[in-house]
């Protein structure tokens, strides 16, 4: 006869490990007992369990409540045991020693591998600001056994660097993603991808990039000066900028206070029916936590009467 077992049994932390040991005997052969022991190098054999054909299952006090025989029906030649709720400390070498009649004793060894799936964590780097050089965007750390793989999935251009720390029964892997911040990266996803044999599928943690910036300010509304004439209704100036965080807007008049009736609504300055009083230099002040910008425009309100008088004069003069 011969013993059938596995070289390696792999389980995920917390799962039950089946340690196989089957005696493939000739007809008439019987298994008297199967002794299971842990036999890590440099240490003596430590009893796990004894399966006896008459006395039944004896479990070592160290494994009390954790070792069972597989559920019935059971083959009398099957010396397999179940190790319940595998923990990292269970990883190691195990030996089954089978006493048979009349063939004698046989033994086989297997290695129990306990996979410890990682619980990854993503830590964003310092605040990203346009104009910075190469900056840490985020770091991702995952610890497991064996060492997990940590990679990045993103459309953003950047560089990665990884380091690994070995512990007694596991390894921690940290990967960093560096980039040169630009406004085009704002709102872009940066995803840490962790792969491990103990995971059914990759674990993904997504971080949305926030790059602080403030665009140059400009004012719209004066494209056609001829529209800015006395009596015109609905005239407005709009301050154009963009930024992260979203900027706030403030309007002032350089050559005095804002005329009465002029309405400030965020980035928009709304005018009542125009008068010559509304002529002047207007300043749009844009700011966020990152920076501030100014843009100024000169408003010159035309008097149609003056224009038409001149025209008449010109006509009459001709």
């Amino acid at each position: 006869g011969e013993l059938e077992t596995s070289d390696v049994v792999t389980v995920v932390l917390g799962q039950d490990a089946k340690l196989p040991c089957f005696y493939r005997g000739d007809s008439g052969e019987q298994v008297g007992q199967v002794a299971w022991a842990r036999v890590d190098a440099g240490e003596g054999a430590q009893e796990l369990a004894l399966l006896h054909s008459k006395y039944g299952l004896h479990v070592s006090p160290a494994y009390e409540g954790r070792v069972e025989q597989p559920p019935p029906p059971r083959n009398p030649l099957d010396g397999s045991v179940l190790l319940r709720n595998a923990v990292q400390a269970d990883e190691g070498e195990y030996e089954c020693r089978v006493s048979t009649f009349p063939a004698g004793s046989f033994q086989a060894r297997l290695r129990l591998r306990v996979l410890v799936p990682p619980l990854p964590s993503l830590n964003p780097g310092p605040a990203l600001e346009e104009g910075q050089g190469l900056t840490l965007a985020a770091s991702c750390t995952a610890e497991g056994s064996p060492a997990p793989s940590v990679t990045w999935d993103t459309e953003v251009k950047g560089t990665t660097s990884s380091r690994s720390f070995k512990h007694s029964r596991s390894a921690a892997v940290t990967s960093e993603f560096h980039l040169v911040p630009s406004r085009s990266m704002n709102g872009q996803p940066l995803t840490c991808v962790v792969s491990h044999p103990g995971l059914l599928q990759d674990q993904r943690i997504t971080h949305i990039l926030h790059v602080s910036f403030l665009a140059e300010a400009s004012v719209r509304g004066l494209e056609d000066q001829n529209l800015w004439h006395i009596g015109r209704e609905g005239a407005m100036l709009k301050c154009l900028s963009e930024g992260q965080p979203p900027p706030s807007y403030n309007w002032t008049r350089l050559d005095g206070p804002l005329p009465s009736g002029v309405r400030v609504d965020g980035d928009t300055l709304g005018f009542p029916p125009l008068t010559t009083e509304h002529s002047g230099i207007y300043v749009c002040h844009v700011s966020n936590e990152f920076s501030s910008r100014d843009s100024q425009v000169t408003v010159d309100v035309l008097d149609p009467q003056e224009d038409s008088g001149k025209q008449v004069d010109l006509v009459s003069a001709s």
Epitope: Q33, A35, E47, L50, K54, Y55, G56, H58, R97
Partner: antibody, heavy 123, light 107 residues
Framework: EVQLVESGGGLVQPGGSLRLSCAAS????????MSWVRQAPGKGLEWVSG????????HYADSVKGRFTISRDNSKNTLYLQMNSLRAEDTAVYYC????????????????WGQGTLVTVSS | DIQMTQSPSSLSASVGDRVTITCRAS??????LAWYQQKPGKAPKLLIY???SLQSGVPSRFSGSGSGTDFTLTISSLQPEDFATYYC?????????FGQGTKVEIK
């Protein structure tokens, strides 16, 4: 024929010492775990101590730990129990018994017993 | 330590009677249980090992059953030579422990 014969019992004063012997024959003594079991007058059986085959690895009942020492001489097929600091409650018939080691510290039932030797601790 | 509780502590029966003695372990011991018979002034004699296996030379009227924590010794038809004290013993752990005994007396 398997035989276990105890000797060395007798009357001893409290605090005294006694050495019991158990001569084995009719089987491969060195292959068996051996133990001492006692029975106080009119009482039940109480396991006292046990020793593994091929070694001096021993176990003791809490009631005798530190006072009794079990040993074996495989060349003489003899089991011993050295009893020190004896107390009145140690008064009993002492039996030696054999059991087969299955594996680790797991034994079969004790299939053969000696006839016993009486130890009386009294002043 | 594992406690072994035997019942009854004594019983009176007649020749030919069926006698049952029970033994309960304080925790599971698989089938690591033996039954011994002891007569006055004699050494204990192994009757049943592994809870239900009859020791060589023991009459077949003796039988054992059970596994885990509850065990039974049955004498199917009591004979005159069976009047004695019976002990159960677990040898699952060290120290091995005995029940307190059941004395079977003539009615």
């Amino acid at each position: 024929e398997v035989q276990l014969v105890e000797s060395g019992g007798g009357l001893v004063q409290p605090g005294g010492s006694l050495r019991l012997s158990c001569a084995a024959s009719g089987f491969n003594f060195y292959n068996y775990g051996m133990s001492w079991v006692r029975q106080a007058p009119g009482k039940g059986l109480e396991w006292v101590s046990g020793i593994k085959p091929h070694s001096d690895v021993a176990h003791y009942a809490d009631s005798v730990k530190g006072r009794f020492t079990i040993s074996r001489d495989n060349s003489k097929n003899t089991l011993y129990l050295q009893m020190n600091s004896l107390r009145a409650e140690d008064t009993a018939v002492y039996y030696c018994a054999r059991a087969e080691l299955l594996a680790f510290d797991v034994y079969t039932a004790s299939d053969y017993w000696g006839q016993g030797t009486l130890v009386t601790v009294s002043s | 330590d594992i406690q072994m509780t035997q019942s009854p502590s004594s019983l009176s029966a007649s020749v030919g009677d069926r006698v049952t003695i029970t033994c309960r372990a304080s925790q599971g011991i698989s089938s690591y249980l033996a039954w011994y018979q002891q007569k006055p002034g004699k050494a204990p004699k192994l009757l049943i090992y592994a809870a239900s296996s009859l020791q060589s030379g023991v009459p077949s009227r003796f039988s054992g059953s059970g596994s885990g924590t509850d065990f039974t010794l049955t004498i199917s038809s009591l004979q005159p030579e069976d009047f004695a004290t019976y002990y159960c013993q677990q040898h699952y752990t060290t120290p091995p422990t005995f029940g307190q005994g059941t004395k079977v007396e003539i009615k």
